[in-house]
Interface confidence: medium
Amino acid sequence: QRLPRMQEDSPLGGGSSGEDDPLGEEDLPSEEDSPREEDPPGEEDLPGEEDLPGEEDLPEVKPKSEEEGSLKLEDLPTVEAPGDPQEPQNNAHRDKEGDDQSHWRYGGDPPWPRVSPACAGRFQSPVDIRPQLAAFCPALRPLELLGFQLPPLPELRLRNNGHSVQLTLPPGLEMALGPGREYRALQLHLHWGAAGRPGSEHTVEGHRFPAEIHVVHLSTAFARVDEALGRPGGLAVLAAFLEEGPEENSAYEQLLSRLEEIAEEGSETQVPGLDISALLPSDFSRYFQYEGSLTTPPCAQGVIWTVFNQTVMLSAKQLHTLSDTLWGPGDSRLQLNFRATQPLNGRVIEASFPAGVDSSPRAAEPVQLNSCLAAGD
């Protein structure tokens, strides 16, 4: 025969999940940090396509003799975006160029705007967070999470998709950014660096943390992901920085202990349900918020980012396991899977607490605080 040829939050509990202030003096950026963190969204930072088929990829099957059958891809039909809330828009990240780049990459061709024009947008993510410039918004209330404590059954799918490790979440995980701003969790995934090299996506005053968790949510105003892509507030991501601490994090260990099973790109395993909120900081009241984009193609904008002020602590061994176990495309380790920080282009990052009014040693000179834009929200 012949044939022709898919992450972003929850609490740790107990108040011991991490440092309440991620901005200590020792956190100043190091010279060895990945040069990409300084880059604008240049072409070298722009990933390529994922494995949804390109229109040119889609074939009609032309029967041949039984001896030499053929599955042809030239005219293959695509699948329209499914009606399930958890499902992505097939057409949103299709490689129109027909260059057979079925996987986008970090730090290589093809340029991300060629994969998805939205990647060249003005309001992209991740960004550098400067607490001194954040606008304190008392209207930003503590986040509310409901149904995040999952029973062991049904099991969840944990997958190495070639650019992250992703845990697909079942229906029923509800999150509210505030009154009338309700969301359902879809999946979570991580971003990390390599040995001695941090790999968070967001940075704080230029400092990159060892890793970052993203829990991706869909607004209850939309039935499907494809409807929400690019719509203001259609998607919301909870993000938390992961740092090194003295003890093993038992919540994360439930996932990290299974990474060897999915070392190969494209492999997956089933893990018992767990308390997803235990993967997040315990303090849901102190966070930064801004409107940005998905940090990988299709880079759709309108995404509400909520970045916790408190960090989550993992042991050194756990951080090493995260950054040194998985493999990506082409026999390369899956490492440094973060996008360079993007310009704010006039955006104001809001804070749910007075982040700019502290005695941080980094405030070299008085700074004019931005005013809260969401006071009436």
Partner: antibody, heavy 118, light 107 residues
Framework: SGPGLVKPSETLSLTCTVS????????WSWIRQPPGKGLEWIGY???????NYNPSLKSRVTISVDTSKNQFSLKLTSVTAADTAVYYC??????????????????WGQGTTVTVSS | ETQLTQSPGTLSLSPGERATLSCRAS???????LAWYQQKPGQAPRLLIS???SRATGIPDRFSGSGSGTDFTLTISRLEPEDFAVYYC????????FGGGTEVEIK
């Protein structure tokens, strides 16, 4: 492609060649259909070599991939008459973007008939 | 392993009539990873629906899928002569399984 007749206790070997596109970054499945019966999934392989097999056949099945030839192959050991079927290869579509989703088998080969008989 | 049971086994209808095919799972389908296929004699199956309700490109809108959890339905609103075939549902959870099929025959 492969032999249409296999003797009991021997190994059935089939190869599926992908044309008109790259085998890379997709999952590729084998499915079979005994005469007059329904479809049975045998297993799939990712272009990287990761596999997932039907638990009932796992002990006898090996699926491999040769990206340089744009081919993937099926080996089924210790065959019996119950393995007589039309064997199909198909593209199994999973998205691998920031969202995971399963789309189904969207491209199929025309099938090859394998008879197990002495 | 999730078992899929399709009913009825055979559906005898006339062109222009409405066909309703059922697929029931032994346990809840993981995030509605359920697909429907059409197979005509001597041909390979053809993907109709994925995600329980989304038509594959090129599939006429008389085909629609619905359902969630354990109960799923494929509806053909108005049967055309070319729609008489066998229809299979398929799920993807820990493993991948097909239903036993429903034959839609001309009355």
């Amino acid at each position: 492609s492969g032999p249409g007749l296999v003797k009991p206790s021997e190994t059935l070997s089939l190869t599926c060649t992908v044309s008109g596109g790259s085998i890379s970054s997709y999952y590729w499945s084998w499915i079979r259909q005994p005469p007059g019966k329904g479809l049975e999934w045998i297993g799939y392989i990712y272009y990287s070599g990761s596999t997932n097999y039907n638990p009932s056949l796992k002990s006898r099945v090996t699926i491999s991939v040769d990206t340089s030839k744009n081919q993937f192959s099926l080996k089924l050991t210790s065959v019996t008459a119950a393995d007589t079927a039309v064997y199909y290869c198909a593209r199994d579509q999973h998205s691998s973007s920031v969202y995971y989703y399963y789309y189904g088998m969207d491209v199929w080969g025309q099938g090859t008939t394998v008879t197990v008989s002495s | 392993e999730t078992q899929l049971t399709q009913s009825p086994g055979t559906l005898s209808l006339s062109p222009g009539e409405r066909a309703t095919l059922s697929c029931r799972a032994s346990q809840s389908i993981y995030i509605n990873y359920l697909a429907w296929y059409q197979q005509k004699p001597g041909q390979a199956p053809r993907l109709l629906i994925s995600g329980a309700s989304s038509r594959a490109t090129g599939i006429p809108d008389r085909f629609s899928g619905s359902g969630s959890g354990t109960d799923f339905t494929l509806t053909i609103s108005r049967l055309e002569p070319e729609d008489f075939a066998v229809y299979y549902c398929q799920q993807y959870g820990r493993s991948l399984t097909f239903g036993g099929g429903t034959e839609v025959e001309i009355k």
